[in-house]
C-alpha cells in the first residue's frame, strides 16, 4: 500500500515572519516522477507541480493549510503555516509532539536581528535566560512539557515579548501485541 506523503518545512518552523522564505517539500517513497505533485493551499490547487513548493518573501495570504499529493496516492496530512508581523516570534519544531520525540524552541527576531537577554517562559514561569540568543532543546518530550510558551528579549536595546504558543505533547500509541 503506497504511503501517504508527508510535508516537511525547511527551515523547520511553521511560524515565520512576513518577508521570510520557506520551502515545503512533499516527501514519500518511490516518488521519482517529475512534475507529479499536487499542492493544495487552503483547499485550492496550486500551480506548483514540483515536489518542493517555495514560498519567497512570505505574505500574510501565504498563511494557512498546506497539503500535497503524489499521483493518485492519498493526500498528505495538513501542515499549517502562519505568517506574522512582530518583533519576536517564538518558533517550535512542532506544536503537537509525540512523547519521547525532540522539541526545539527558537526566539526569533524580526529581520533576523540579534535578540539578547532572552528569557523563555512556560505557563508564565521563566524557564531559561541567556544573554545571547539560544534555542531551547528538549531531547525527549514528556506530557509535562505541554503548556503555553513565550519568550522575551531585547532587539535594538528595546524590550519585546513574543505571542504565546501552545505546545501539546501526546502519549505515543501503545504497540498492539496479538497472541499467537
Amino acid at each position: 500500500v503506497p504511503q501517504k506523503p508527508k510535508v516537511s518545512l525547511n527551515p523547520p518552523w511553521n511560524r515565520i515572519f512576513k518577508g521570510e522564505n520557506v520551502t515545503l517539500t512533499c516527501n514519500g517513497n518511490n516518488f521519482f516522477e517529475v512534475s507529479s505533485t499536487k499542492w493544495f493551499h487552503n483547499g485550492s490547487l496550486s500551480e506548483e507541480t514540483n515536489s518542493s513548493l517555495n514560498i519567497v518573501n512570505a505574505k500574510f495570504e501565504d498563511s494557512g493549510e498546506y497539503k500535497c499529493q503524489h499521483q493518485q496516492v492519498n493526500e498528505s496530512e495538513p501542515v499549517y503555516l502562519e505568517v506574522f508581523s512582530d518583533w519576536l516570534l517564538l518558533q517550535a519544531s512542532a506544536e503537537v509532539v509525540m512523547e519521547g520525540q525532540p522539541l526545539f524552541l527558537r526566539c526569533h527576531g524580526w529581520r533576523n536581528w540579534d535578540v539578547y537577554k532572552v528569557i523563555y517562559y512556560k505557563d508564565g514561569e521563566a524557564l531559561k535566560y541567556w544573554y545571547e540568543n539560544h534555542n531551547i532543546s528538549i531531547t525527549n518530550a514528556t506530557v509535562e512539557d505541554s503548556g503555553t510558551y513565550y519568550c522575551t528579549g531585547k532587539v535594538w536595546q528595546l524590550d519585546y515579548e513574543s505571542e504565546p504558543l501552545n505546545i501539546t505533547v501526546i502519549k505515543a500509541p501503545r504497540e498492539k501485541y496479538w497472541l499467537q
Epitope: 536581528w113 540579534d114 545571547e132 532587539v155 535594538w156
Partner: antibody
Framework: EVQLVQSGAEVKKPGSSVKVSCKAS????????ISWVRQAPGQGLEWMGR????????NYAQKFQGRVTITADKSTSTAYMELSSLRSEDTAVYYC??????????????WGQGTTVTVSS | QSVLTQPPSASGTPGQTVSISCSGS????????VNWYQQLPGTAPKLLIY???QRPSGVPDRFSGSKSGTSGSLAISGLQSEDEADYYC???????????FGGGTKLTVL
C-alpha cells in the same frame, strides 16, 4: 564591501548649526543602524545617538538631547547628523558608524572617515 | 568624565603581553556586552573585539577580550610596533539608554 563616506570639513560660527552626511555604499543600508560618535581634539570618543533607518527611530545621548537631530534617507542610503546652537566645545571630528545587528550584537563594525567641524567666531 | 574607566596609558616592549582594563557598573558592563575599538594615529576607530571576546575577520588572534562581572579586559600578546594606538572599550548603558565609551588608553610600544 560596505563603506561609509562622510561630507567634508565645516567651519561654523557659534550659535549656528551644522549638518554632516554619511553615505553608505556597497551594502544594505536600512537593516542596520547608523550611530554618530564625536571626538574633540586630544579627547576620547563620545556617543551622540543613532538611527535605525527602516524603523525611523532615533535616540540620543542625554547630553545632546534637544540639540542634535539624526535622520536618514533610505532612497539614497544616507544618514545625517545635525547639531544646533554650536559652541566652541563642539569643535571635533564627527564619525558615523554602522551598527551591526547580525551576530555582532549591535557593535559598530564599519566607520566613516570622519568630518572635522570647527566652531569659531 | 567617562562612565567606563580605563587607564590613560599602557606600555610594553615588542613581544610582550599587555592588558588594558575597563571598569563599569551593573547598568552597563554588568548587564551588557563589551566591545573594543582601536584607533591608530590620525585614523577612524576600528572594531577590534565584539561580544566581549569575538574578533572580526582580519583582526589577528594576538588580540583577545574577556569580561567578568562589571569589568572587561583587552589583552594584546606578541606586542608589535603597529599596535601603538588608542584603545577604547564601549558598552550600552541601560540607565542612560545610550552607548558609552571608556576614556581611552594610549598604548606605547617601547
Amino acid at each position: 564591501e560596505v563603506q561609509l563616506v562622510q561630507s567634508g570639513a565645516e567651519v561654523k560660527k557659534p550659535g549656528s548649526s551644522v549638518k554632516v552626511s554619511c553615505k553608505a555604499s556597497g551594502g544594505t543600508f536600512s537593516s542596520y543602524a547608523i550611530s554618530w560618535v564625536r571626538q574633540a581634539p586630544g579627547q576620547g570618543l563620545e556617543w551622540m545617538g543613532r538611527i535605525i533607518p527602516i524603523l525611523g527611530i532615533a535616540n540620543y545621548a542625554q547630553k545632546f538631547q534637544g540639540r542634535v537631530t539624526i535622520t536618514a534617507d533610505k532612497s539614497t542610503s544616507t544618514a545625517y547628523m545635525e547639531l544646533s546652537s554650536l559652541r566652541s566645545e563642539d569643535t571635533a571630528v564627527y564619525y558615523c558608524a554602522r551598527v551591526n545587528p547580525f551576530g555582532y550584537y549591535y557593535a559598530m563594525d564599519v566607520w566613516g572617515q570622519g568630518t572635522t567641524v570647527t566652531v569659531s567666531s | 568624565q567617562s562612565v567606563l574607566t580605563q587607564p590613560p596609558s599602557a606600555s610594553g616592549t615588542p613581544g610582550q603581553t599587555v592588558s588594558i582594563s575597563c571598569s563599569g557598573s551593573s547598568s552597563n558592563i554588568g548587564t551588557n556586552i563589551v566591545n573594543w575599538y582601536q584607533q591608530l594615529p590620525g585614523t577612524a576607530p576600528k572594531l577590534l573585539i565584539y561580544r566581549n571576546d569575538q574578533r572580526p575577520s582580519g583582526v589577528p588572534d594576538r588580540f583577545s577580550g574577556s569580561k567578568s562581572g562589571t569589568s572587561g579586559s583587552l589583552a594584546i600578546s606578541g606586542l608589535q610596533s603597529e599596535d601603538e594606538a588608542d584603545y577604547y572599550c564601549a558598552a550600552w548603558d541601560d540607565s542612560l539608554n545610550g552607548g558609552i565609551f571608556g576614556g581611552g588608553t594610549k598604548l606605547t610600544v617601547l
